[in-house]
Interface confidence: low
């Protein structure tokens, strides 16, 4: 066969669907690889062809679109399963071609099982809610296109294993779940089960997402440098190890890049000749506020090093701060016998 632009296996789009539920999968070519959409391709005389490779096999096979009740079908650029079976797991390829043009991409599809409490190997999307921030909503995700707007589905929401009814601050409102005031206790997995009829059959769509309650922007502050500070002096003798921690608190800020760095005499440590190492550790509070610690270490400090300026800097979307460490050379204790002897006029 003639050459085909092969985009390979698109593992970035690892698609997971639940067993025994409808699934609609769009060909990724039009979403991520080509500059035109399906309608344009179709009107230009291009044909979309689907095939697949079963799990643990190398053989590419055509997809059987003649199964009972049209269990698998194709509609425009969408591959439909009504419903999926466990052995539908495999790598699926969509190929767009005519006599002069060919482009294809493969993607993995995994059909997963869930238990009665909706636990499964499914990777769950995370939805962040601001703590004590007034009414916030989550929406049952990825249900568009499964049924026409004339169909009114029934939606049931669960937190973990429990149906949400008569919860204090969580109220189901159709496709939305409203949190009147989000609290840490609202952290957890939430599942919506959408039930709808189609051609005399009843289908269920199960969607689970993780809710994580995070720090509110109204509580956010610029970075706070806890160390170094004015209350600790790093007093060292030449030859000793100098260790200075820079500990910075960052309020949670959505999509903020938190940065901590040291300067020595105004330069980044990489730009100076002294043998300095920096180790970083990061911890998070329950609301994803972040504490970063960068420990500056000079194994054998010299008297020159003890005269330098060591400044810890921090930056987030809320602002930039800096704090200098108080470093000084330890005055050696008097050598008692010699000085005493000198004091008595000994020579």
């Amino acid at each position: 066969s003639e050459r085909c632009d092969d985009w390979g296996l698109d593992t970035m789009r690892q698609i997971q669907v639940f067993e025994d539920e409808p699934a609609r999968i769009k060909c990724p070519l039009f979403e991520h690889f080509l500059k035109f959409n399906y309608s344009t391709a179709h009107s230009a005389g291009l044909t979309l062809i689907w095939y697949w490779t079963r799990q643990d096999r190398d053989l590419e096979e055509p997809i059987n679109f003649r199964l009972p009740e049209n269990r698998i079908s194709k509609e425009k650029d969408v591959l439909w399963f009504r419903p999926t079976l466990l052995n539908d797991t495999g790598n699926y390829t969509c190929m767009l071609r005519n006599t002069t043009y060919c482009s294809k991409v493969a993607f993995p599809l995994e059909v997963v099982q869930k238990d009665s409490c909706f636990n499964s190997p499914m990777k769950l999307p995370v939805h962040k809610l601001y703590i004590e921030y007034g009414i916030q909503r989550i929406t049952c995700p990825n249900v568009d296109g499964y049924f026409p707007s004339s169909v009114k589905p029934t939606i049931t929401w669960y937190m973990g294993c429990y149906k949400i009814q008569n919860f204090n601050n969580v109220i189901p409102e159709g496709m939305n779940l409203s949190f009147l005031i989000a609290l840490i206790s609202n952290n957890g997995n939430y599942t919506c089960v959408v039930t709808y009829p189609e051609n005399g059959r009843t289908f269920h769509l199960t969607r689970t997402l993780t809710v994580k309650v995070v720090g509110s922007p109204k509580n956010a502050v610029p970075p706070v440098i806890h160390s170094p500070n004015d209350h600790v002096v790093y007093e060292k003798e030449p030859g000793e190890e100098l260790l200075i921690p820079c500990t910075v608190y960052f309020s949670f800020l959505m999509d903020s890049r938190n940065e901590v760095w040291w300067t020595i005499d105004g330069k980044k440590p990489d730009d100076i000749t002294i043998d300095v190492t920096i180790n970083e550790s990061i911890s998070h509070s329950r609301t994803e506020d972040e504490t970063r610690t960068q420990i500056l270490s000079i194994k054998k400090v010299t008297s020159e090093d003890l005269k330098r300026s060591y400044v810890c800097h921090a930056r987030s979307a809320k602002g930039e701060v800096a704090k200098a460490a108080k470093v000084k050379q330890k005055v050696p204790a008097p050598r008692y016998t010699v000085e005493l002897a000198c004091g008595f006029g000994a020579t």
């Epitope: 509580n219 956010a220 502050v221 602002g319």
Partner: antibody, heavy 118, light 111 residues
């Protein structure tokens, strides 16, 4: 220095604003806290304000009944719908260190008495 | 909510003696930001110790703070009659912004 004012006798359900006037330091770099102490009882933290970023924090029991705000030289505490349990001496205090940290409060006012009674 | 339990609630000491006051937190205090205050009747609190063990400016060295995490102690050595007062511990927590909490207080009586 730090000085509270505005304490008085107020009826339940009314509203009252206490003012903390500061001098000798900038509110933009110090955190300020409001506290209260009922007669014969212990100290209770109400909330903090860090004017540098306009951020406020409140004790969990406050539930919107107290609001802290600031100008360049004052920090206000607004009490809405007070009850007899809000009868106390109210103190304003400054954090020991510039920059918002949690060390403690080293500069306190003498307090202002609020009596809630019908 | 965070709870700070101070013990004992009252302690009596002779001049020159030693007093130990404990403060236990129900959860870890952020960066050991625990302060100790002294309060005399009709006066505002006075900061004695901050950051668990640092002596505030002008405070005599007979006051000593120690501890970390959830367990903290204030020790007054060589107690003087002027030390008769109520002592409070105060912790700073970090969760949703910054949160403070006080212990219930310990009354120190000097005989």
């Amino acid at each position: 220095s730090v000085e509270e004012s505005g304490g008085r006798l107020v009826t339940p359900g009314g509203s009252l604003t206490l003012t903390c006037t500061v001098s000798g330091f900038s509110l933009s770099i110090y955190a300020m806290g409001w506290f209260r102490q009922a007669p014969g009882k212990g100290l209770e933290w109400i909330g903090d304000i860090y004017a540098g970023s306009g951020s406020t924090w409140y004790a969990s029991w406050v539930k919107g009944r107290f609001t802290i705000s600031s100008t360049s030289t004052t920090v206000d505490l607004k009490i809405t719908s007070p009850t007899t349990e809000d009868t106390a001496t109210y103190f304003c205090a400054r954090e020991i260190d510039a920059g918002y940290v949690g060390y403690g409060f080293n500069l306190w006012g003498q307090g202002t008495l609020v009596t809630v009674s019908s | 909510a965070q709870a700070l339990t101070q013990t004992p609630s009252s302690v009596s000491a002779a001049v020159g003696g030693t007093v130990t006051i404990n403060c236990q937190s129900s959860q870890s205090v952020y960066s050991d930001y625990l302060a100790w205050y002294q309060q005399k009747p009709g006066q505002p609190p006075k900061l004695l110790i901050y950051w668990a063990s640092k002596l505030a400016s002008g405070v005599p060295s007979r006051f000593k703070g120690s501890g970390s995490g959830t367990q903290f102690t204030l020790t007054i050595s060589g107690v003087q009659s002027d030390d008769a007062a109520t002592y409070y511990c105060q912790a700073t927590y970090n969760g949703r912004g910054w949160y403070r909490a006080f212990g219930e207080g310990t009354e120190v009586v000097v005989k």
